[in-house]
Amino acid sequence: STGSKQRSQNRSKTPKNQEALRMANVAENSSSDQRQACKKHELYVSFRDLGWQDWIIAPEGYAAYYCEGECAFPLNSYMNATNHAIVQTLVHFINPETVPKPCCAPTQLNAISVLYFDDSSNVILKKYRNMVVRACGCH
Amino acid sequence: STGSKQRSQNRSKTPKNQEALRMANVAENSSSDQRQACKKHELYVSFRDLGWQDWIIAPEGYAAYYCEGECAFPLNSYMNATNHAIVQTLVHFINPETVPKPCCAPTQLNAISVLYFDDSSNVILKKYRNMVVRACGCH
């Protein structure tokens, strides 16, 4: 259609990433948001602190890690962002009222094995899935 | 071992969820945080608004949805929380300084098909993964 042709011709004048690049420059030159980017942080969890010491036999605790940080425009490739997160970041950048920024959350989780007492005081060894953060990303 | 036996006996006096229940009551009776719980919200994205109208032919936009809301203790089952998120919520509840609350993020995403111009102005139909939020949860 003529509309499509016109748009196809427009592309050489307006590359699809021109607006994105313009906004990236604004974002990178803006010092208003100096929060650290989304990444994995250290966290050791003691089962005693959670009040679970009377039913968990071992381990006493574990390195759980956690995710925290900014998911701001432009999202870097190492932020493991989904396509939806990329769109949401752009929508937020254009108009923050519309949506929040995507959030920094685990993208890969590992299991741990726990030795515990069940309700009949039997000792059970069980693998608990998704207990340890392996990687973080913007979602 | 004697320690294990002792802990096993303690369990009948101190059920493993007693502390959790105590904290749940505190949490539920606390009116300090009346934010809506983590859930899926409406979001319609116009490709024109993103500055992509010159390379995306169709659709003009799509219902992307987004996730927003509180991931506070206690996490309900419908919040699709991972084991790590449950632990993190409890750690935050006990000491908010330690870690942030888990964040509300997509747990299921769907694809959309997009008709667009490539860099040689060919018309391409491509399925873009992870573009539409189908469900949200606490991570």
């Epitope: 009222e97 | 979001l43 116009s46």
Partner: nanobody
Amino acid sequence: EVQLVESGGGLVQAGGSLRLSCAASGFTFDDYIIGWFRQAPGKEREGISCISSSDGSTYYADSVTGRFTISSDNANNTVYLQMNSLKPEDTAVYYCAAHAKWPYGTYSFRRCRRASFDSWGQGTQVTVSS
């Protein structure tokens, strides 16, 4: 100029129903989000329901979900709020409000945030007696 006129308020007994109307003019209906807000004496104005008339997307606050229904009549540029099972705590002045989908079509409801809306009606009083 955007104009919004509410009607349909009144006095009703608890458990009863009312239908509020918001007649809109001065803008292209499909390009706007229309919301219903309410303000009880001494309380903040709260967003209770919103609609995008172009695609029928709706939002409801938890306090009215299952009792109130928002709908739009695009031919007549009118938005309705059907209120059933009314409670004394629903007593308030009800306002109709509008905001453009920014700027060509992208929108969300963000819990019908008051800050998003720039055009307001004069309001209509709803009183629910016990």
